[in-house]
């Protein structure tokens, strides 16, 4: 809970101008939902729905709220202490290796495979070979005989976009 964000934790493009060192570290920090003033004396609230900070910090600026992309639904709005939570729309998912976009779930499994897992906002449908039970990985063949299924219902948030 007492995690702390400093200027150094931010990516170069998020860093603000260098700050003067404050004498007492325990007095030089602002709570979640705030950032520090340029002179280091005051804490200033983030703007509700526009920016946020999640931890005690010495940031000169709050972090900009994520805007959900088209193809995403907003699970919870941005507050001064929490970023927006976005989730892929029903029938689409976000892979760990391509978190920047939601991809369409497959509508069915290739021939010789059975579906064992539904489409969720964070995973495609899961297919296994009928005989061996081994998972199918890789792209679906261009020509396939599919076992159609309806997409799963989103159940919980995937990782934040943005």
């Amino acid at each position: 809970e007492s995690a702390l964000i400093t200027q150094q934790d931010l990516a170069p493009q998020q860093r603000a101008a260098p700050q003067q060192k404050r004498s007492s570290p325990s007095e030089g920090l602002c709570p979640p939902g705030h950032h520090i003033s340029e002179d280091g004396r005051d804490c200033i609230s983030c703007k509700y729905g526009q920016d946020y900070s999640t931890h005690w910090n010495d940031l000169l600026f709050c972090l900009r709220c994520t805007r959900c992309d088209s193809g995403e639904v907003e699970l919870s709005p941005c507050t001064t202490t929490r970023n927006t939570v976005c989730q892929c729309e029903e029938g689409t998912f976000r892979e760990e290796d391509s978190p920047e976009m939601c991809r369409k779930c497959r509508t069915g499994c290739p021939r010789g495979m059975v579906k064992v897992g539904d489409c969720t906002p964070w995973s495609d449908i899961e297919c296994v070979h009928k005989e061996s039970g081994t998972k199918h990985s890789g792209e679906v063949p261009a020509v396939e005989e599919t076992v159609t299924s309806s997409p799963g219902t989103p159940a919980s948030p995937c990782s934040l976009s943005g």
Epitope: S2, S45, K47, W56, T79, T81
Partner: antibody, heavy 118, light 107 residues
């Protein structure tokens, strides 16, 4: 149920110090900032500062810097506000108040009357 | 420091009346404004935060509005138990400051 229970009334002489306690229960003590607000008899409310027990972070209003010290004891879920070099103008009811994230102040202690009189 | 000026400083109204209290800040507080109710011998009680969000358990006759520097607390239909002093408070920048209070009485 969230409760903030403060110590009893105090009578002090000018120049002395007073230490007021505020015992928290019903929530995770180290996850919330505690503020101190005072109210002179028949007057308005005045913010004094905060302490975050989870990290020991403090911030004091400029007016009280050098005279106020806020501390926390995580073992007893208690915060303390000590005010030194008391003068008659410090006669007031002192409140601890919990700061909910982005919300000031969602729960208050019952108040502690500190009377400074020679 | 940001100064908050409440008006009126006191008012008397009848049960069932619509009551409005205003709070003007000396600078823009970006909606970071709360309202409290304080009854005699009790600590303040949070009514409204972020200018217009009602705290859970607060009757819906209490509402807040405003932005920038001008804010309003409205009691749509005054009840006898609403007799109290009402304070606005900015939580935009430290030091957090309060208005001087508005004393509300029943006619």
């Amino acid at each position: 149920e969230v409760q903030l229970v403060q110590s009893g009334a105090e009578v002090k002489k000018p120049g002395a110090s007073v230490k007021v306690s505020c015992k928290a229960s019903g929530y995770t003590f180290t996850s919330y900032t505690m503020h101190w607000v005072r109210q002179a008899p028949g007057q308005g409310l005045e913010w004094m500062g905060w302490i975050y027990p989870g990290g020991g972070y403090t911030k004091y209003a400029q007016k009280f810097k050098g005279r106020v010290t806020m501390t926390g004891d995580t073992s007893t879920s208690t915060v303390y506000m000590e005010l030194s070099s008391l003068r008659s103008e410090d006669t007031a009811v002192y409140y601890c108040a919990r700061h909910e994230e982005g919300i000031y102040f969602d729960k208050w202690g019952q108040g502690t009357l500190v009377t400074v009189s020679s | 420091d940001i100064q908050l000026t409440q008006s009126p400083s006191s008012l008397s109204a009848s049960v069932g009346d619509r009551v409005t209290i205003t709070c003007r800040a000396s600078q823009d507080v970006s909606g970071a404004l709360a309202w409290y109710q304080q009854k005699p011998g009790q600590p303040p009680k949070l009514l409204i935060y972020w200018a217009s969000t009602r705290e859970s358990g607060v009757p819906d006759r209490f509402s807040g509005s405003g932005s920038g520097t001008d804010f309003t607390l409205t009691i749509s239909s005054l009840q006898a138990e609403d007799v109290a002093v009402y304070y606005c408070q900015q939580h935009y920048i430290t030091p957090f400051t309060f208005g001087q209070g508005t004393k509300l009485e029943i006619k």
